[in-house]
């Protein structure tokens, strides 16, 4: 009884099972009751990559340099030629029949995966903490500069397209130091005023004073380490000394007691 189905690597023809031709060979004649399937090897520029009953081998793919293609792997009687693209180009499709230039990632985007001969550049948006300020087919998103590690402070925040701008710490320190210095000055001034008040109210135990001309009291004379001859410097900006202005006495005139 003739078979209705055949084993693997066989095919049914004229009510009998014939062997398929192995990869790299084409069918010349089907098997008969007396002979096996006749197969012949594919020629130099041809191939067949499966067990088959093809009467013609397939032509190897041509990697056309005019389309930016070059041979990645030479074809055999069992495999097709594999084409790839020249440097800087990638295949337009899976079959790689022509090539196109790699895409560049715009500013704000970095390269997630560098393009190959068969795949385009894959870009990704730069996440927070990273930036890209160039249009490139190779550069990844770069991390923002760390101002702290350079003993600097952030003067301008970074974006996905720009790096942070770092600056010296002065301004920031000044914001803390100035109020502290002013506070200290204020306390000193207060103490001085209290001291002056006390000195001014001190009674004279010896003889009653005759009426005197108003006199200047140098309240700095009693302060330890003070030089009455030296002008007092104001300390204002960031505790930096400010030079005494010319034509101004550094003494405070005190009104004569009544």
């Amino acid at each position: 009884e003739p078979p209705t189905a055949c084993r693997e690597k066989q095919y049914l023809i004229n009510s009998q099972c014939c062997s398929l031709c192995q990869p790299g060979q084409k069918l010349v004649s089907d098997c008969t009751e007396f002979t096996e399937t006749e197969c012949l090897p594919c020629s130099e520029s041809e191939f067949l990559d499966t067990w088959n009953r093809e009467t013609r081998c397939h032509q190897h793919k041509y990697c056309d340099p005019n389309l930016g293609l070059r041979v990645q792997q030479k074809g055999t009687s069992e495999t097709d030629t594999i084409c790839t693209c020249e440097e800087g180009l990638h295949c337009m499709s899976e079959s790689c029949e022509s090539c196109v230039p790699h895409r560049s990632c715009l500013p704000g985007f970095g390269v997630k995966q560098i393009a190959t001969g068969v795949s385009d550049t894959i870009c990704e948006p730069c996440p927070v903490g990273f930036f890209s300020n160039v249009s490139s087919a190779f550069e990844k998103c770069r991390p923002w500069t760390s101002c702290e590690t350079k003993d600097l402070v952030v003067q301008q925040a970074g974006t996905n397209k720009t790096d942070v701008v770092c600056g010296p710490q002065d301004r920031q320190r000044a914001l803390v130091v100035i109020p502290i210095c002013l506070g200290i000055l204020f306390v000193i001034l207060l103490l001085v005023l209290v001291f002056i008040k006390k000195v001014a109210k001190k009674p004279n135990d010896k003889a009653p004073h005759p009426k005197q001309e108003p006199q200047e009291i140098n309240f700095l004379d009693d302060l330890p380490g003070s030089n009455p001859a030296a002008p007092v410097q104001e300390t204002l900006h960031g505790c930096q000394p400010v030079t005494q202005e010319d034509g101004k006495e550094s003494r405070i005139s005190v009104q004569e007691r009544q």
Epitope: S29, T32, E36, E38
Partner: antibody, heavy 112, light 112 residues
Framework: QVQLEQSGDDLVKPGASVKLSCKAS????????INWIKQRPGQGLEWIGR????????HYNEMFKGKATLTVDTSSSTAYIQLSSLSSEDSAVYFC?????WGQGTTLTVSS | DIVLTQSPLSLPVSLGDQASISCRSS???????????LEWYLQKPGQSPKLLIY???NRFSGVPDRFSGSGSGTDFTLKISRVEAEDLGVYYC?????????FGAGTKLELK
Amino acid sequence: QVQLEQSGDDLVKPGASVKLSCKASGYTFTTYWINWIKQRPGQGLEWIGRISPGSGSTHYNEMFKGKATLTVDTSSSTAYIQLSSLSSEDSAVYFCTRNDYWGQGTTLTVSS
Amino acid sequence: DIVLTQSPLSLPVSLGDQASISCRSSQSIVNSNGNTYLEWYLQKPGQSPKLLIYKVSNRFSGVPDRFSGSGSGTDFTLKISRVEAEDLGVYYCFQGSHVPLTFGAGTKLELK
């Protein structure tokens, strides 16, 4: 119906060459191998060789290499056997066959 | 080369008898695809051989069912259940599995 029509009987001189033909009809010529068989008077059957009309591939019995050359002409569906340097040993009936069908045979006589 | 040994070389029978012819090969004639190309032919005097059995046991079209083939590997048998007058002649076994293809020496079926 399948038929294999062989050329007529031949008488040739020793040392000469001869080309016998076998014209196929009633089937696709390229589908079946053509075998050539030799039978000397009162003897058994000897396989000379075979040819695939589809590819031109040939297989020979070592004993007949250099003696027999098998060819085909697919345009006329005809197979040929050329026998060279003939001697009386080559006197025999030559059959062409595709196994299930046989030609009627050609009697070759080599004699001076 | 594969040698096919037939026995007996001569088989005298009476019409209506059962006849059995053996064919032994010097090595297995199962080919790489698992096929056994063993055939049986009958040649009557002055005629071309005719195919009876192919692939060990398959009867060729038009062959009476009194002919049957069996065997495997290296041992094969042709049986004729009831011999008729038209069955007389020389029977050849033939192997087409391995080149060079070979015939047995033949068994002559004749009347007692």
